[in-house]
Interface confidence: medium
């Protein structure tokens, strides 16, 4: 931001009633009054250049210094070229000096050169030549500079002619203040420029109402600089939640609008199935039958929990079931469902039911699933079973009603047998198999059905209630057609797969495990 | 006594020159901002030209522009002007006029081109 | 150019009488204003400059006023000796321009 100037003097501005001090008086500077773009301007000018040595001072009034510590003198004036008078006159000079005395009081007529200390000499960028002058045309020539620290009530300047035709037509003295400032949402007050050009004052800024440091921000900082400008901010001020920047303040969200933290971006509008907001609000309410998860953004909608699984089916496959569904038609909102798989066991001859999560195994963790498939596997056969599936997402937790659907199968067979050759000779082959424990109970015996590949006219059929047999009489180097069957109370349960198993030839005799 | 003394006119042609010449005396010639000023017959008056006390600068009125031209020799107090391709309307008794720029002992100046000083006119005829 | 027009071009008076000539200037030019007297066969004599200002040796009857673009040219009591014509001139740019001249006559 640019430097605030608070003038302390202004001779231009005051219409040539100041009544500046002349030494010697009657001589050397004089006010004079001209016209210039068909205004009447003041100016206190000294032509004294045919004159030999010359000392003329022009004193201001005494300038009080109020809490000014470095002032600014900004001079506005016009040099005539020495050479632009009859022979050049030896003894005009193009330069003039500025001096300074601070005092506690007004020492009126009193005039003491001996009191002021010089600031500088003023030489002209410019001076006015013969053809400028001769044609009125005015080189005005612009100097500043400063002076500080002041420390006492007030000062003068002063301005000694040495010689030269030179014309004072502005006098401004000002000092120089970092002006009030409103700088990311924080307020710095107006600061007095410091006297010292290294320095930099450290302002410490107040948040505008509804503004806050955020967490762990820097509190608002600027430094004043000696020319009046506001320099290096540090930190910075947020509207708060329920608030929004709108210029340089933090206006209330507008009904239908909210903002959950204190932060830099806008409100926003209240998300879908929300009840209208009212002004400054942090939130927005769902709408009944809707809700938020813990983890929900506030600018997430409000959702629900998803309808049942859509479609469910479950496909037995001996003593396992494949079930199947596909995703609720409604995912209340959400994408983050998941489905539990839970299982009742009912026995038909009783029709008491439980649950069978122990005795069963799935394919996958039954809970949590993300995907719409499950085996489940080492079902009892002639048993009831009932699945449920349940679809969950982030707010199912907040209600106490479920969302599920239920697919129901008999198992009437055990599972098929898992058949092993366990060893042959020229002519035997030793057979075991193995059923899920669960089901064992219920299998009476294990029928055994084999014969020769490619002779479909005769089989052989071997009967046991132990999990292996040995087939003998069987033809060397020949392979069989084998099938191991468990027979159960009510019937027949699911066979095996055919196995091919070769006897050894003749050649290679001797009992040989595979 | 300030005095003003114009030479150089008469009868001229149109198309042709005349050399005019004002001889001062009773001042100090170099301070002074002389100029030429004339007066066609029954007429008043016009400003033709002007000349700074040490030479500069030179303005002309835009109806002798390119053709005439004003300039002095401080040394001997004497300001000249120098008429090409004369006209008709040209004919006037042609006044050297000085202003003392002595006044200009000034940091910024007033303007200060009247004329305090007359000399009393000599007569440019062109005809053919 | 800057024109200047003088009113009356002519005008008639006795002896003693108060005559007043003015001059209008076609944009401002200040105060920056001179008015001179021409007899027959005379040149030009400077009476006024800055609009208001007695050149040395003019007689008091003369005075001037105005700014801008109205300047007036006044005799407070009419002699004999100031039969003549009135021109006034403009100097506030270099283009230097008269009036066209008041011719004060005998009544």
């Known amino acids: 931001a640019q430097g605030k100037e608070v003038v302390l003097l202004d001779f231009a501005a005051a219409g040539g009633e100041l009544g500046w001090l002349t030494h010697p008086y009657g001589k050397g500077w004089d006010l004079m009054q001209n016209i210039m773009n068909d205004m009447p301007i003041y100016m206190y000018s000294v032509c004294n250049v045919m004159s030999g040595d010359q000392d003329n001072w022009l004193r201001t009034n005494w300038v009080y210094r109020g809490e000014a510590e470095r002032i600014f003198i900004e001079l506005k004036f016009t040099v005539r070229d020495c050479n632009s008078f009859p022979g050049g006159a030896s003894s005009c000079k193009e330069t003039f000096n500025l001096y300074y005395a601070e005092s506690d009081l007004d020492y009126g007529t009193n005039f003491q050169k001996r009191l002021f200390t010089k600031i500088d000499t003023i030489a002209p960028d410019e001076i006015t030549v013969s053809s400028d002058f001769e044609a009125r045309h005015v080189k005005l020539n612009v100097e500043e500079r400063s002076v500080g620290p002041l420390t006492r009530k007030g000062f003068y300047l002063a301005f000694q002619d040495i010689g030269a035709c030179v014309a004072l037509l502005s006098v401004r003295v000002y000092y120089k203040k970092c002006p009030e400032l409103l700088q990311g949402l924080a307020h710095f007050p107006e600061t007095i420029a410091g006297s010292d050009a290294p320095s930099l004052a450290t302002v410490a800024g107040t948040c505008v109402d509804h503004a806050v440091v955020p967490p762990g921000g820097e509190e608002p900082r600027m430094h004043c600089a000696v020319d009046g400008e506001w320099l290096v901010p540090i930190g910075q001020c947020l509207c708060q939640a329920g608030y929004e920047k709108v210029e340089d303040a933090c206006q209330a969200c507008s009904p239908g609008f909210f903002k959950f933290e204190a932060s830099e971006s806008p409100c926003l509008e209240c998300p879908e199935h929300t009840l209208p907001s009212p002004e400054g609000a942090t939130s927005c309410e769902c709408e009944e039958g809707f809700f938020r998860a813990p983890q929900d953004p506030a600018s997430m909608p409000c959702t629900r929990p998803p309808s049942a699984p859509h479609y469910l089916t479950a496909v037995g496959m001996g003593a396992k079931v494949e079930l199947r569904w596909t995703p609720p038609q409604d995912s209340g909102g959400r994408e983050d469902i998941v489905y539990s798989v839970t299982c009742e066991q009912c026995w038909p001859e009783s029709g008491e039911c439980g649950p069978c999560e122990a005795s069963v195994r799935y394919s996958e963790p039954p809970h949590g699933l993300t995907r719409t498939s499950v085996t489940v596997s080492d079902l009892e056969p002639h048993m009831n079973y009932t699945f449920t599936v349940e679809a969950r997402n982030g707010v199912s937790g907040l209600v106490t009603s479920r969302s599920f659907r239920t697919a129901s199968v008999s198992i009437n067979q055990t599972e098929p047998p898992k058949v092993r050759l366990e060893g042959r000779s020229t002519t035997s082959l030793s057979v075991s198999w193995s059923i899920p424990p669960p089901q064992q109970s219920r299998v009476w015996k294990y029928e055994v059905t084999y014969r020769k590949k490619g002779d479909s006219n005769s089989y052989n059929v071997r009967r046991t209630e132990g999990f292996s047999v040995t087939l003998d009489d069987l033809a060397p180097d020949t392979t069989y057609l084998v099938q191991v069957q468990a027979l159960t109370q009510e019937g027949q349960g699911a066979g095996s797969k055919v196995h091919e198993f070769q006897t050894l030839s003749p050649e290679g005799s001797g009992n040989l495990a595979v | 006594e300030v005095q003003l003394l114009e030479s150089g006119g008469g009868l001229v042609q149109p198309g042709g020159s005349l050399r005019l010449s004002c001889a001062a005396s009773g001042f100090t010639f170099s301070h002074y901002m002389m100029a030429w000023v004339r007066q066609a017959p029954g007429k008043g008056l016009e400003w033709v030209s002007r000349?700074?006390?040490?030479?500069?600068?030179?303005h002309y009125a835009d109806s002798v522009k390119g053709r005439f031209t004003i300039s002095r020799d401080n040394s001997k107090n004497t300001l000249y002007l120098q008429m090409n391709s004369l006209r008709a309307e040209d004919t006037a008794v042609y006044y050297c006029?000085?202003?003392?720029?002595?006044?200009?002992?000034?940091?910024?100046?007033?303007?200060?081109?009247?004329?305090?000083?007359w000399g009393q006119g000599t007569l440019v005829t062109v005809s053919s | 150019d800057i024109q200047m027009t003088q009113s009356p071009s002519s005008l008639s008076a006795s002896v003693g009488d108060r005559v007043t000539i003015t001059c209008r200037a076609s944009?401002?030019?200040?105060?920056?204003l001179a008015w001179y007297q021409q007899k027959p066969g005379k040149a030009p004599k400077l009476l006024i400059y800055k609009a208001s200002n007695l050149h040395t040796g003019v007689p008091s009857r003369f005075s001037g006023s105005g700014s801008g673009t109205e300047f007036s040219l006044t005799i407070s009591g009419l002699q004999p000796d100031d039969f003549a014509t009135y021109y006034c001139?403009?100097?506030?740019?270099?283009?230097?321009?008269f009036g066209q001249g008041t011719k004060v006559e005998i009544k």
């Open positions: 944009q401002s030019i200040s105060t920056w």
């Open positions: 001139q403009q100097y506030n740019v270099y283009s230097r321009t």
């Open positions: 006029a000085g202003y003392d720029s002595g006044y200009d002992y000034v940091a910024v100046a007033g303007p200060a081109e009247y004329f305090q000083h």
């Open positions: 000349i700074g006390p040490s030479g500069g600068p030179t």
